[in-house]
Each structure stands twice: as structure tokens, then as C-alpha cells.
Interface confidence: low
């Protein structure tokens, strides 16, 4: 069957792109590096603006193999710092508490449910 617009906005597709390209600093070619940079910037902006983390939540960075995980030690960065609750200077309120998953210091909502709502209305 033909792919519908809805198929392109499935969480799995978002997840695959995020896991493969977010903070991937070891691409096979320059074109991929350009794409990776674009994906990283988009996700950073999304997570900061919408106060969300990953596609389904912070657990995305724990459950799946990702470029982010190969670039960052799990103990140092269980998830991107953009998942942390920020102050108005756009710096994590308390990085240690965010890393430890202390409620109130990191965003536990996934970004997909925030962006899929507006898309599903059209």
C-alpha cells in the first residue's frame, strides 16, 4: 500500500533518525555530516523550546544504541543536556540532579506527543 503522510510522522521514523544522526560526529562523508548537524540542531531546538526529551522520553537514550551514546559516557550524560530543566540563561538548573534523574530537574515527556498533536489535526 502507498505510504500516507501519517507514516512519515510515526515515532519509529523520528526515533531512527534521532538515534542515527543526533550528535553523530563520525559520518562517512561530508553530506552526512551536514545532515547530522542539521538533525542535531533541530533536536536541540525542539527539546529546549518544548521542554521535552527524545521521541518517547529520556528512556530513548537508555534503551537504544545511538550515535549520542557512542560519543558520550552514560554516567556523564545519560541523555542530552537539552533534556535538563534550564534556567533563563539556557543552562541546566542543576546538571548533577539532571544526570541522576531527580524529578523536576529533567524533562520526562517525549517530544513526539508534543509535535504529533498539531500534525494530526491537519
Amino acid at each position: 500500500t502507498a505510504a500516507t503522510q501519517q507514516d512519515f510522522f510515526t515515532p519509529n521514523l523520528f526515533l531512527k533518525q534521532m538515534l542515527e544522526r543526533y550528535q553523530n560526529n563520525s559520518p562517512p562523508n561530508n553530506d552526512d555530516q551536514w545532515k547530522n548537524n542539521g538533525v542535531t540542531k533541530t533536536w536541540d531546538r525542539l527539546m529546549l523550546q518544548d521542554n521535552c526529551c527524545g521521541v518517547n522520553g529520556p528512556s530513548d537514550w537508555q534503551k537504544y544504541t545511538s550515535a549520542f551514546r557512542t560519543e558520550n559516557n552514560d554516567a556523564d550524560y545519560p541523555w542530552p543536556r537539552q533534556c535538563c530543566v534550564m534556567n533563563n540563561l539556557k543552562e541546566p538548573l542543576n546538571l548533577e540532579a539532571c544526570k541522576l534523574g531527580v524529578p523536576g530537574f529533567y524533562h520526562n515527556q517525549g517530544c513526539y506527543e508534543l509535535i504529533s498533536g498539531p500534525m494530526n489535526r491537519h
Epitope: R81, N87, N88, P92, N94
Partner: antibody, heavy 123, light 107 residues
């Protein structure tokens, strides 16, 4: 145990210069933003200057009252914080505290304070 | 700049009392409010950060609350060693600013 020990205070004439030092120990100095906070005799506390860590390009910030006159700097290899004060005014008379920010990236809290060094600007 | 106002400059209380010190910001500071204790000898210590989080080593009789522009520090059971001046400070926006202080004395 976090320790911050200020030195370099003293009596100086208006328009004169003075350099304050702060020796830090008991923590990884190079990873923390550091601040100077002052208190004029019988008055409240006033934030003066802030310098971030190397990973944040040693970015500096100043209160308007000292901008272009004071310079904050640091020497990570010696765990030292400095405040170069030029063109001093009588209103700069105060106890100057060396202050370390708290853990994490919430820059707005001052977790550890030194005992202070007194600067008196008078003719 | 954000102005921090502590309307009560001095406060008298008895040992064992519950004491509340107030602080108001000139604009919403999103809970970025910290409290400090300054002893008569000039020693300054952080008590509470981000409105209500107790700094390490601070006795549990100290607590903080508030939101928006209005915040308070409470000492639930006043002890002799709590005699000091208490300052609030906003960490929301540079320049970081302090209240003028509330001096706590024994009745």
C-alpha cells in the same frame, strides 16, 4: 572541604589600583564558575563579577558599577581567582568575598564563600 | 535590574519560636531564589537555593517556599546559633541581586 582564602585588601587612595587574590582548595577549581561579591560597611551584599570555566571560554560578567574598572581573571593551574581593581572610588570600600557557584549549571547560586578581604578607598 | 526587597530589616524572636522572613522580587524570578546567612563575624553561608532546596549541611529546621515574586524563609525552631542576618538573592537574571537583609535578634 571547600576552602576559599582571599588576600590583597588594604588601604588605597581614590583613583588607585589594587589586586585581590583568592586561593581555592578542596574542589576541582577548573570546572567551576567563580565570583566576587562585596559588602560595603553596614550595607547589603552586592555581586561584582563572575568568570566561567575554560570549557565556557572563561566568559566574564560584571556589575555596571564596576564595568571597565575591574577585571576578573583566574589561573586554573594554581587554583587562583583574581580581581584587578583600577580607578578605585570611595564607594568601592567594602569587604570583598571570593565565592564559588553551586554544583551543576545553575549559575545563580553562591554555594561557598571565603572569609573576605577588606578594601578601604580613602584619601 | 531586578530589585529584591526585604521589608523587615530586623526581627526579634524567642528561642524555640517559628520565624518567617519575607522577600519580594520586582518581577517574576521563576523560583530562582536563594537564601544566605551572615553571622556577626561576617561569615556567609548558603542555606537554601532554588526556593526550597536545602544546601548540604544545613539543618532541616530551615525551609523555603514561594513562587513568582514572593518568597519566604522559615526557621521552625529558633536556636541561639541562628542569630544572624539573612539575605535573599535572585539567580534568575544577571546581574544577580540581593535583598538588603533581615537581622534576626533574640527577644
Amino acid at each position: 572541604e571547600v576552602q576559599l582564602v582571599e588576600s590583597g585588601g588594604g588601604l588605597v587612595q581614590p583613583k588607585g589600583s589594587l589586586k585581590l587574590s583568592c586561593a581555592a582548595s578542596g574542589f576541582s577549581f577548573n570546572t567551576y564558575a567563580m565570583n566576587w561579591v562585596r559588602q560595603a560597611p553596614g550595607k547589603g551584599l552586592e555581586w561584582v563579577a563572575r568568570i566561567r570555566s575554560k570549557s565556557n571560554n572563561y566568559a566574564t560578567y560584571y556589575a555596571d558599577s564596576v564595568k571597565d574598572r575591574f577585571t576578573i581573571s583566574r589561573d586554573d593551574s594554581e587554583s587562583m581567582l583574581y580581581l584587578q581593581m583600577n580607578n578605585l572610588k570611595t564607594e568601592d570600600t567594602a569587604m570583598y568575598y571570593c565565592v564559588r557557584q553551586g554544583d551543576g549549571y545553575y549559575v545563580g547560586w553562591f554555594a561557598y564563600w571565603g572569609q573576605g578581604t577588606l578594601v578601604t578607598v580613602s584619601a | 535590574d531586578i530589585q529584591m526587597t526585604q521589608t523587615t530589616s530586623s526581627l526579634s524572636a524567642s528561642l524555640g519560636d517559628r520565624v518567617t522572613i519575607s522577600c519580594r522580587a520586582s518581577q517574576d524570578i521563576s523560583n530562582y531564589l536563594n537564601w544566605y546567612q551572615q553571622k556577626p563575624d561576617g561569615t556567609v553561608k548558603l542555606l537554601i537555593y532554588y526556593t526550597s532546596r536545602l544546601h548540604s549541611g544545613v539543618p532541616s529546621r530551615f525551609s523555603g517556599s514561594g513562587s513568582g515574586t514572593d518568597y519566604s524563609l522559615t526557621i521552625s525552631n529558633l536556636e541561639q546559633e541562628d542569630i544572624a542576618t539573612y539575605f535573599c538573592q535572585q539567580g534568575n537574571t544577571l546581574p544577580f541581586t540581593f535583598g538588603s537583609g533581615t537581622k534576626l535578634e533574640i527577644k
